[in-house]
């Protein structure tokens, strides 16, 4: 009778084991072991027992002890089970961002590991088990589906293998994959709201505001604002689940025409975009041209108004005839026209909006000087010793210089308060002088003496 010890061994891959082959007869003709494994016999006293060291055991094996005794030949097998933890435990790659409400399939691949009967694959979210299955196939694959929730944001998913050799008197060997950190997001189906001027004048600045509600996590949202090829640099303000991006936009003559204003919101691996057209226009103020801004009374003056070729103008409230970008009027300059404003209003239609521009010019009419009865009375009668203010106003443009002299030397204090004396009596010659000429007027002052009783 042949016996083997141990009859069952579990050992690590590449390990060694001592196997004892024994026989019940004292003088066996033969006693040995049959195995493809490298073996070394350890010398022992006696003939009915042999010990072999079997080394570099790479896979399960069944070495067989045999003996040949007088009563016949017999054999006994020992069962060597090799254990080793998996070579690779990996979660199949996934995009790190996943939309809330989507089904996410987690797939764990396990390469190798033995004995497979003791190998289990566990899918985890954090420390919570999602699925546990025995490892089957090469590679062993375990999958589970997770409905992505908002509160999964930042959660770590992993895959663990458990080689449980505790029933064989060994330990529980665990291997864990690199974690997959889930980033969940909500990007609403509604496009962002874009508020901007529909028209924008060359060499001016406009403000563009792009906003969107219902985002999660809002801090991770990227906002791209652009006008044509010009990237705008917005200031972004965040709310709980909303943002508002505000940017200044400057346009130049090169931008003239219809431009696309875009606001794109990127969150996770999705984006929402709003497009709007902005018309960039050039519309200089109309030009008011006077033949001469300063003319003498009686001169013929032409007032012209010229504007953008597509504009329609009115000059002093009178539309151009025919309606168009030019208007003019003719007048003979009178003193009343001095300081008169000529206002040209131009209207241009840009992208359905009416844009108004005004320009005003003032006409200066040179006239005078003038001295008339109303403003410079020819006769004053004042009681002696009374307080009086002689008034004489000369008119003209430019304003004339006025002097009133008696006998060519004694001045009348125009506009000053004086005490009336006898000396004040007499005829004065008032002379008004300007670059436009000179006029004179006689003014008589009578002084009434009080009656003494």
């Amino acid at each position: 009778q042949t016996s083997v010890s141990p009859s069952k061994v579990i050992l690590p891959r590449g390990g060694s084991v001592l196997v004892t082959c024994s026989t019940s007869c004292d003088q066996p003709k033969l006693l040995g072991i049959e195995t493809p494994l490298p073996k070394k016999e350890l010398l022992l006293p006696g003939n009915n027992r042999k010990v072999y060291e079997l080394s570099n055991v790479q896979e399960d094996s069944q070495p067989m002890c045999y003996s040949n005794c007088p009563d016949g030949q017999s054999t006994a097998k020992t069962f060597l089970t090799v254990y080793w933890t998996p070579e690779r435990v990996e979660l199949a790659p996934l995009p790190s961002w996943q939309p809330v409400g989507k089904n996410l399939t987690l797939r764990c691949q396990v390469e190798g590991g033995a004995p497979r009967a003791n190998l289990t694959v566990v899918l985890l979210r954090g420390e919570k088990e999602l699925k546990r299955e025995p490892a089957v196939g090469e590679p062993a694959e375990v999958t589970t589906t997770v409905l992505v929730r908002r509160d999964h944001h930042g959660a770590n998913f992993s895959c663990r293998t458990e080689l449980d050799l505790r029933p064989q008197g060994l330990e529980l060997f665990e291997n864990t994959s690199a974690p997959y950190q889930l980033q969940t997001f909500v990007l609403p189906a509604t496009p962002p709201q874009l508020v901007s001027p529909r028209v924008l004048e060359v060499d001016t600045q406009g403000t563009v505001v792009c906003s969107l509600d219902g985002l999660f996590p809002v801090s991770e949202a990227q906002v791209h604002l652009a006008l044509g090829d010009q990237r705008l640099n917005p200031t972004v303000t965040y709310g709980n689940d909303s943002f508002s991006a505000k940017a200044s936009v400057s346009v130049t003559a090169e931008d003239e025409g219809t431009q696309r204003l875009t606001c794109a919101v990127i969150l996770g691996n999705q984006s929402q975009e709003t497009l709007q057209t902005v018309t960039i226009y050039s519309f200089p103020a109309p030009n008011v041209i006077l033949t001469k801004p300063e003319v003498s009374e009686g001169t013929e003056v032409t007032v012209k108004c010229e504007a953008h070729p597509r504009a329609k103008v009115t000059l002093n409230g009178v539309p151009a005839q025919p309606l168009g970008p030019r208007a003019q009027l003719l007048l003979k300059a009178t003193p009343e026209d001095n300081g008169r404003s000529f206002s040209c209003s131009a209207t241009l239609e840009v992208a359905g909006q009416l844009i108004h521009k005004n320009q005003t010019r003032e006409l200066r009419v040179l006239y005078g000087p003038r001295l008339d009865e109303r403003d410079c009375p020819g006769n004053w009668t004042w009681p002696e010793n009374s307080q009086q203010t002689p008034m004489c106003q000369a008119w003209g443009n430019p304003l004339p210089e006025l002097k009133c002299l008696k006998d060519g030397t004694f001045p009348l204090p125009i506009g000053e308060s004086v005490t009336v004396t006898r000396d004040l009596e007499g005829t004065y010659l008032c002379r008004a002088r300007s670059t436009q000429g000179e006029v004179t007027r006689k003014v008589t002052v009578n002084v009434l003496s009080p009656r003494y009783e």
Partner: antibody, heavy 120, light 112 residues
């Protein structure tokens, strides 16, 4: 004992296709993946692709993707490698080899090889 | 693709003497789990390759202990402590760390 037995030598014309088989025995067929490796004269060994004999999943070397197709018949414990649009450069000895799916412990057992000659 | 360069191309050795073959990789062969998937094969004339060493230094079943592997990162060595007649053939290194898997160009071991 573990054995991988491949089909016999093939001679093909350029543009044709060839299908080589590899039958596994002496082990649980679905416990290991099967890889295909070729050796052209004077060239280094070239890994072509792998199949999971359990699930049928495959991975290919980009160089052969679209031209090589690896399949498995578990009931016959046999894997197949079909190479289409053959050209003279495909003249080589084609081997199947047993291993883990990602080959982490090396290709422990190999078939005897199938010689393919592509000539007009 | 990862290129494995073997040196020497040919190595004439006296029986009973040691032999050494080098394999250098164009990039590190350390996988993200810390393991290094570099293997050695021997191909005798007219036969398929045979696995000798897996994962740098682990002898495969039935491989004599005169064969040993060492190295790390990008530099690896196969040593035969005492060459025997049956060791004649072409030795290949191979990597299964990066996709696609690649082989070295081979080193021919011959007896002087």
């Amino acid at each position: 004992q573990v054995q991988l037995v491949q089909s016999g030598a093939e001679v093909k014309k350029p543009g044709a296709s060839v299908k080589i088989s590899c039958k596994g025995s002496g082990y649980t067929f679905t416990d290991y993946a099967l890889h295909w490796v070729r050796q052209a004269p004077g060239q280094r060994l070239e890994w072509m692709g792998v199949i999971s004999t359990y699930s049928g999943n495959t991975d290919y070397n980009q160089k052969f993707r679209g031209r090589a197709t690896i399949t498995v018949d578990t009931s016959a414990s046999t894997a197949y490698m079909e190479l289409s649009s053959l050209r003279s450069e495909d003249t080589a000895v084609y081997y199947c080899a047993r291993s883990l799916y990602f080959g982490s412990s090396g290709f422990d057992y190999w078939g005897q090889g199938t010689a393919l000659t592509v000539s007009s | 693709d990862v290129v494995l360069t073997q040196t020497p191309l040919s190595s004439p050795v006296t029986l009973g003497q040691p032999a050494s073959i080098s394999c250098r990789s164009s990039q590190t062969l350390v996988y993200r789990n810390g393991n290094t998937y570099l293997h050695w094969y021997l191909q005798r004339a007219g036969q398929p390759p045979r696995l000798l060493i897996y994962k740098v230094s682990n002898r495969f079943s039935g491989v004599p202990d005169r064969f040993s592997g060492s190295g790390a990162g990008t530099d690896f060595t196969l040593k035969i402590s005492r060459v025997e007649a049956e060791d004649v053939g072409v030795y290949f290194c191979s990597q299964n760390t990066h996709f696609p898997y690649t082989f070295g160009g081979g080193t021919k071991l011959e007896i002087k």
